[in-house]
């Protein structure tokens, strides 16, 4: 089990990268002047208390920015949000903080991120560029849920 967050860069199958704009994560085509965020991920240390065979439960943060991805209900719908939070504080909690946890599954080079708090809901980007990251239940339709991870340093 990792005890230090692993920095990664994430892009989708259309080579769009994640960018922070007004405290919102959006997916944009990779260009010269685009500075993608570096994502920190760390495995939950209470993996034995979570569902087996769903993927590796991880916390996702924005490297160096004290912001973490979380899922919360807005009305009836789970939404993806950025919250001010130290990823190591989440890691060290005595129980899994499910609202901040995602099951990370890998199939070949593709990764998916499923909300632990809202099973069946995945981090996604709209097929159109320049859109915020969202949560979706609809895989492979109007939204892209497959991402590529590149480990940094």
């Amino acid at each position: 089990k990792s005890e230090m967050p692993q920095p990664v860069s994430i892009q989708d199958i259309n080579h769009r990268v994640w960018v922070l704009q007004d405290q919102i994560l959006i997916a944009v085509p990779r260009k010269d002047r685009v500075s993608p965020v570096t994502i920190s991920l760390i495995s939950c240390r209470h993996v034995e208390t979570l569902e087996k065979d769903r993927g590796n439960p991880i916390y996702l943060g924005l490297n160096g920015l004290n912001l973490c991805l979380m899922c919360a209900k807005a009305g009836d719908q789970p939404t993806l949000q950025l919250k001010e939070k130290d990823i190591m504080d989440l890691y060290n909690q005595p129980e899994p903080v499910k609202s901040f946890l995602f099951y990370h599954s890998q199939s070949g080079r593709n990764s998916t991120f499923e909300s632990v708090a809202f099973p069946g809901w995945f981090i996604a980007v709209s097929s159109e560029g320049g859109c915020p990251l969202i949560l979706t239940q609809e895989l492979g339709k109007a939204n892209t849920t497959d991402f590529g991870l590149t480990m940094l340093f």
Partner: antibody, heavy 121, light 109 residues
């Protein structure tokens, strides 16, 4: 409002089993952890264990492994504690509590009223 | 298994300040013990006061504060009210299990 309502007092013979219920209202037990704690007469609190009702995973204090079984029925929003092979030392008030994450830490924010289990021959 | 020890009883004057402590048999209490404090008033339900050493639970009056003090977890009550007369229990995390203290009976007199 948020409430945890436990089943009534029980008197059991040594060697018997007992099942205590904890019915939640005002929130969905799938969204939190339910802890069980006991208080023997004149004693402090003792942690028994906890259940994650959403997926049924449990943690127990080593002392209660094999003695206590925690379950939950999300359709009725109820958590259960079953104690087996009862002895007089198991006479205590048993409490359920919600252990919830509120932005920065986990807290015991709501408790049941307690269920007195008396073990006597 | 670890033993968690609290003062059996303490007395404070109305408006006064009192500190309840929680000692671990395994050594100094640290932030990774995620100290919790709960209150039991006669004839009432338990209520959670503090989580994660120093985070007040929602709705808990500001006169209650949690900290680490001399290798122990501490609950400080500043400006005690008559209604604060109660039993107070601390609980410490040790890896994957939780251990409660024996409780402190606080009298406001």
């Amino acid at each position: 409002q948020v409430q945890l309502v436990q089943s009534g007092a029980e008197v059991k013979k040594p060697g018997a089993s007992v099942k205590v219920s904890c019915k939640a209202s005002g929130f969905n037990i799938k969204d939190t952890y339910i802890y069980w704690v006991r208080q023997a007469p004149g004693q402090g609190l003792e942690w028994i264990g906890r259940i994650d009702p959403a997926i049924g995973t449990t943690r127990y204090d080593p002392k209660f492994q094999g003695k206590a079984t925690l379950t939950a029925d999300t359709s009725t929003n109820t958590a259960y504690l079953e104690l087996s092979s009862l002895r007089s030392e198991d006479t205590a008030v048993y409490y359920c509590a919600r252990y919830d994450y509120s932005g920065s830490s986990f807290y015991f924010d709501y408790w049941g009223q307690g269920t007195l289990v008396t073990v006597s021959s | 298994q670890a033993v968690v020890t609290q003062e059996p009883s303490l007395t404070v004057s109305p408006g006064g300040t009192v500190t309840l402590t929680c000692r671990s048999s395994t050594g100094a209490v640290t932030t990774s013990n995620y100290a919790n404090w709960v209150q039991e008033k006669p004839g009432q339900l338990f209520t959670g006061l503090i989580g994660g050493t120093n985070d007040r639970a929602p709705g808990v009056p500001a006169r209650f504060s949690g900290s680490l003090l001399g290798g122990k977890a501490a609950l400080t009550l500043s400006g005690a009210q008559p209604e604060d007369e109660a039993d107070y229990f601390c609980a410490l995390w040790y890896s994957n299990h939780l251990v409660f203290g024996g409780g402190t009976k606080l009298t406001v007199l």
